[in-house]
């Protein structure tokens, strides 16, 4: 499970109005860090192990996911045709 945590604003810069956000995720046994719906998530470790990236549903609703030919990551294709590529280090 993941929750989005809003960090305190930088008090040394009063004009700064945007707080930083980060995810805190507590994964269950058999899960490790991944991406679901373009956000940090805990996913089945076997998905990562086998590089079946699209099985963790990394793209936003309505986008099409495809694993890169060399299994190094995935692409998310928006309905308008714009493609976002993510590679896993």
């Amino acid at each position: 499970t993941c929750e989005i945590v809003t960090l305190d604003r930088d008090s040394s810069q009063p004009r700064r109005t945007i707080a930083r956000q980060t995810a805190r995720c507590a994964c269950r046994k058999g899960q490790i860090a991944g991406t679901t719906r373009a956000r940090p998530a805990c996913v089945d470790a076997r998905i990562i192990k086998t590089k079946q990236w699209c099985d963790m549903l990394p793209c936003l609703e309505g986008e099409e996911c495809k694993t890169l030919p060399d299994n190094s990551g995935w692409t998310c294709t928006q309905p308008g045709g714009r493609i976002k590529t993510t590679t896993v280090s």
Epitope: R24, C25, K29, I32, A33, P40, A45, K49
Partner: antibody, heavy 129, light 104 residues
């Protein structure tokens, strides 16, 4: 190089308590789940306890549940096992082990016994009166 | 409990296969030359091999059974091999009873 160095073993009395410490080096300690595994005479390997990378989760084997406490200090790169109400069957060699998966920042991750990639040399515990 | 054979034997240069079944998540294989002595991981996460382990050691997962293969076994490989994984409910670690490899 990854090194795990256990200490705290030795002769213990039945009903007493022991505290084992594992000092880690050579890797980002706070990113890895850690285990204690023991080998008792005439038996194979036995899962004793484990702790998540950030210390928020702990789990224990049935033989020590209710008597054991695992904890970690990520600042000192140590993991500790406290075992109370010692019994003769607790006699054996206790190993500290690391789970290979490097948990990224913001995540709390369990280790996996099948992902143990490094072991300490072990510390021998003898429970006898 | 995990199921693995209690013993296997082979001549130098032969291929040895040791199976382990009955667990969940991933499997590892741990070598021990004598009881109470140091444990060495030869395979972790089903098929990953530590950099200092010879390439003759390999692991493969099929369903819920993992197989450790030693291709071209050597006298130095004589040891007890324990498999390890999570129990079927995924709530705790579990180890096999160990397989004694004898090189004839």
């Amino acid at each position: 190089a990854v090194t795990l160095d256990e200490s705290g073993g030795g002769l213990q009395t039945p009903g007493g308590a022991l505290s084992l410490v594992c000092k880690a080096s050579g890797f980002t300690f706070s990113s890895h789940g850690m285990f204690w595994v023991r080998q008792t005479p005439g038996k194979g390997l036995e899962y004793v306890a484990e702790i998540t990378n950030d210390g928020s989760g702990t789990n224990y084997g049935s033989a020590v549940k209710g008597r054991a406490t695992i904890s970690r200090d990520n600042g000192q790169s140590t993991v500790r096992l406290q075992l109370n109400n010692l019994r003769a069957e607790d006699t054996g060699t206790y190993f500290c082990a690391r789970s290979t998966y490097e948990c990224p920042g913001g995540f709390s991750c369990w280790g996996d016994t099948g992902q143990i990639d490094a072991w300490g040399h072990g510390t021998e515990v003898i429970v006898s009166s | 409990a995990l199921t693995q054979p209690s013993s296997v034997s082979a001549n130098p240069g032969e291929t040895v296969k040791i199976t382990c079944s009955g667990g969940s998540y991933s499997y590892g294989w741990f070598q021990q030359k004598s009881p109470g002595s140091a444990l060495v991981t030869v395979i972790y996460w089903d098929d990953e091999r530590p950099s200092d382990i010879p390439s003759r050691f390999s692991g493969a997962l099929s369903g819920s059974t993992n197989t450790l293969t030693i291709t071209g076994v050597q006298a130095d490989d004589e040891a007890v091999y324990f498999c390890g994984t999570e129990d079927i409910s995924g709530t705790a670690g579990v180890f096999g009873a160990g397989t004694t490899l004898t090189v004839l």
